[in-house]
Amino acid sequence: LQPGAEVPVVWAQEGAPAQLPCSPTIPLQDLSLLRRAGVTWQHQPDSGPPAAAPGHPLAPGPHPAAPSSWGPRPRRYTVLSVGPGGLRSGRLPLQPRVQLDERGRQRGDFSLWLRPARRADAGEYRAAVHLRDRALSCRLRLRLGQASMTASPPGSLRASDWVILNCSFSRPDRPASVHWFRNRGQGRVPVRESPHHHLAESFLFLPQVSPMDSGPWGCILTYRDGFNVSIMYNLTVLG
């Protein structure tokens, strides 16, 4: 979109489930009528229009000019449509990955789930909710990032080597918090600052590793909007 015209942004991790929230304010008198509610989710991809599924033509409508800053916009398409009787239609390649929670729908939650989210899912989403006597909408932009943990130096380590683990997610803003942990038999054990563990933002410095440090290390990045991502790395220290 042109600067100054932006919809709320939802971040998701490539390969992980993503929730596209839609819980519009519904007047109390309409809550009992939610079983008859219909919802249509539309997707306008960020780039490169997805191939049309045979037998599922893209939705009718105008094909308007894009803002001057863009090239031609990829054509929008219906991801999923749920009619008043719960009848569903949508785009075939997506359908196994796309879900609406039926119980949620009856509570007024029309969120779309992508299980898992893929890079091609990025773009603008619009949900149109049809109730008995009113229509409501939700709009958001889905951005997808890749999570990774790197070790420097990479590969297997020897006892008393040093290593720096760097936890990252491809998102422009910095995480609000970073938590490190180790996966042990009894679950996650937090990693705290100590002579053996030096924490600095998204880095963990181990000045002298031992075979005891072998195994899975993890971090959780939490962002200001509440989005969080958990990343694991398997450290190998040779005796």
Epitope: L1, A5, E6, P8, T40, Q42, P67, A128, S137
Partner: antibody, heavy 120, light 107 residues
Amino acid sequence: QVQLVESGGGLVKPGGSLRLSCAASGFTFSSYAMSWIRQAPGKGLEWVAYVTSGGDYIYYADTVKGRFTISRDDAKNSLYLQMNSLRAEDTAMYYCTRVAYDYEWYFDVWGQGALVTVSS
Amino acid sequence: DIQMTQSPSSVSASVGDRVTITCKASQDVTTAVAWYQQKPGKAPKLLIYSASYRYTGVPSRFSGSGSGTDFTLTISSLQPEDFATYYCQQHDSSPWTFGQGTKLEIK
């Protein structure tokens, strides 16, 4: 080309009835939601009624609810507005409009309008 | 219902001028705002939808911006055919509502 042509406007007494028709051409009428929008003389635009492409959902402005009925006949490529119990404040130019998408409620094609005058 | 308040109600300008019309929604409508142009005795015409997308065939001098509750229609260099009344409309939720209109007159 894409066209909407209204008919059925005229002068009617308060309490009377009138039926507006809208003939659509140049596009696949059955694939589009449709709406009626009105404009009182010298005033702004007011949305009146809406029907989805499949006719599953119909909505009305509070000012006309219970008095006006929107309907469509996809076989005839036609939209209708049945107006009962007309009041002086219903006097307006009534526009038949195409809704861009069932799920994107702006109006991309407009007819030339049908004038409805309610007066004794 | 969502109220749409346009300002100014009228504006005088000359050919070549840059003109800005604003529209304020009574609640958040994300980017669900359209702009229409209406000339006397004619039906309105769609110019902009979803706050910033120009409709097919609309000249590039027309642009829209905004999100949330504040929206703007800008005409970068007025042409003689641009003197008309402009309306904003929220297309977020029913009932779909319009601003009261801004009349653009020749100075």
